[in-house]
Interface confidence: low
């Protein structure tokens, strides 16, 4: 199974699968996780 | 402007020491997980080692190949991240490159830096 | 350790023409595959993340598919500037590992 953290944050926040978007560095993230380098 | 720093390459011997260092700036430099990714002159890449973010308790992985001789450490009031090298080998030689990535959930951000040359030679 | 192989190693394809890149997973990694662009003395560019999400400011022509062990990235018509080397990752299992790479070459 996967144990990176990504698969950890994505698991609990429901957010396997999800769109683009524009963001801001101040945004308040609902994870962080390593789904790319 | 969103910047990654890589500093601290140079030529070693076998069984040296080097600490590299990555100064960020223009980001949230705390939320961010960071790794280090190699790249042997003309060949592909490789992970290195991650370190998690200080909300995370600053976890680390690192790669079989460097186990036990690599420590990634981040210091987040100075916006910095260290990798302190140690028993270098000949197949250490490579550009090692800083990559932060935060994920938003909606989408992630991604920098690296231009990377720092790690010669081992004797 | 999971072993990503990319095919073919080397591309030769003109501007305009369309370009697809593979990838295969030697064990299952759901959709946690990255792809970068990488040009000669530059840092790796993260084009697709997810299997099949565009980064930030990549152009559409870039799009990636695939789930599971099988994963494509595709450039529908090339552009002078999109010939480089293209590397795979996987983010399912640590170690964290790349595929060896397809250079992506003017013919």
């Known amino acids: 199974s996967c144990n990176t953290a990504t698969c950890v944050t994505h698991r609990l926040a429901g957010l396997l699968s999800r769109s683009g978007g524009v963001v801001k560095d101040n945004f308040v993230p609902t994870n962080v996780g390593s789904e790319a380098f | 402007e969103v910047q990654l720093v890589e500093s601290g390459g140079g030529l070693v011997q076998p069984g040296g020491s080097l600490r590299l260092s990555c100064a960020a700036s223009?980001?949230?430099?705390?939320?961010?997980?960071i790794s280090w990714v190699r790249q042997a002159p003309g060949k592909g890449l490789e992970w290195v080692a991650e370190?998690?973010?200080?909300?995370?308790?600053?976890?680390?992985h690192y790669a079989e190949a460097v186990k036990g001789r690599f420590t990634i450490s981040r210091d987040n009031a100075k916006n910095s991240l260290y990798l302190q090298m140690n028993s270098l080998r000949a197949e250490d030689t490579a550009v090692y490159y800083c990559?932060?990535?935060?994920?938003?959930?909606?989408?992630?951000?991604?920098?690296w830096g231009q990377g720092t040359l790690v010669t081992v030679s004797s | 350790e999971i072993v990503l192989t990319q095919s073919p190693a080397t591309l030769s394809l003109s501007p305009g023409e369309r370009a697809t890149l593979s990838c295969k997973a030697s064990?299952?990694?759901?959709?946690?595959v990255s792809w970068y662009q990488q040009k000669p003395g530059q840092a790796p560019r993260l084009l697709i993340y997810?299997?099949?999400n565009r980064y930030l400011g990549i152009p559409a022509r870039f799009s990636g598919s695939g789930s599971g062990t099988d994963f494509t990235l595709t450039i529908s018509s090339l552009e002078p500037e999109d010939f480089a080397v293209y590397y795979c990752?996987?983010?399912?299992?640590?170690?964290?590992?790349f595929g060896q790479g397809t250079k992506l070459e003017i013919k």
């Open positions: 990559a932060s990535y935060f994920d938003y959930g909606l989408a992630i951000q991604n920098y």
């Open positions: 223009g980001f949230t430099f705390s939320n961010y997980w």
């Open positions: 370190i998690r973010s200080e909300s995370d308790a600053s976890a680390t």
């Open positions: 064990k299952r990694v759901t959709t946690y």
């Open positions: 997810g299997a099949s």
């Open positions: 990752s996987q983010s399912y299992n640590y170690p964290y590992t």
